[in-house]
Interface confidence: low
């Protein structure tokens, strides 16, 4: 029987060009975590394996950093990064636990735009 629960950072927002930490935590189970997959919709971002450590998908290696812990740090955010992210915990003997995070990447504030393009 699967007794565990996944806690996530939930719905979060960050500014374009910035970075954000995606975090999940599995609790209420004694199951052994063998691997955690981080996925964005149908794309694999990264894998953290209990024995082999981290593997970052080649297409994301310039913008994704492992950690802290089993979390994932996304860097150089773009508006296209907006969407659902999933942490998938593979455990034994329980099975698979999945957590969902929604990230919204916002344009820089109007004030910043105004200051940046102000005509002297």
């Amino acid at each position: 029987m699967m007794t565990g629960t996944i806690e996530t950072t939930g719905n979060i927002s960050a500014e374009k060009g910035g970075s954000i930490i995606l975090q999940c935590h599995l609790s209420s189970t004694t199951a052994q975590v063998t691997q955690v997959n981080w996925e964005q919709q149908d794309q694999l971002l990264a894998i953290c394996n209990a024995d082999l450590g981290w593997h970052i998908s080649p297409s994301f290696k310039d913008r994704v950093a492992p950690g802290p812990g089993l979390g994932l740090t996304l860097q150089s955010l773009t508006v296209n990064d907006t969407g659902e992210y999933f942490c998938i915990y593979h455990t034994y003997p329980d099975g698979t636990y999945t957590g969902r995070i929604f990230l919204e990447v916002l344009e820089s504030s109007v004030a910043e735009h105004g200051a940046r393009f102000q005509i002297p």
Partner: nanobody, 123 residues
Framework: EVQLVESGGGLVQPGGSLRLSCAAS????????MGWFRQAPGKEREFVAA????????YYADSVKGRFTISADNSKNTAYLQMNSLKPEDTAVYYC????????????????WGQGTLVTVSS
């Protein structure tokens, strides 16, 4: 090309023992986790045991704990499944499989498979 070749299957009486071998080639054996699965006639393929690439971590299905032992010899590129106290319900085709991110216990997490070796436990 990855190749996994199982051997060691056969007919054995209840309570007997067998040792299955899985010879691997085509990849860096020590960087992959190895798993054993089995499929009985008319049933789905099920997880039996797995061992991490380092050999430190091992995993077993509840039905074989205490009776089966998985091991690996990196120098021989071979994984083993020592099966003791065999029961008729252990009768199945046994497959070995490799995973670069294992050890995991779902068959979908393993990318390469052997052709299988038949184990029959009967008096």
């Amino acid at each position: 090309e990855v190749q996994l070749v199982e051997s060691g299957g056969g007919l054995v009486q209840p309570g007997g023992s067998l040792r299955l071998s899985c010879a691997a080639s085509g990849f860096t054996f020590g960087h992959y986790a190895m798993g054993w699965f089995r499929q009985a006639p008319g049933k789905e393929r099920e997880f039996v045991a797995a061992i991490s690439w380092s050999g430190v971590s091992t995993y077993y299905a509840d039905s074989v704990k205490g009776r089966f032992t998985i091991s690996a010899d990196n120098s021989k590129n071979t994984a083993y499944l020592q099966m003791n106290s065999l029961k008729p319900e252990d009768t199945a085709v046994y497959y070995c499989a490799s995973s670069p991110y294992g050890p995991l216990y779902r068959s979908t997490h393993y990318y390469d498979w052997g052709q299988g070796t038949l184990v029959t436990v009967s008096s």
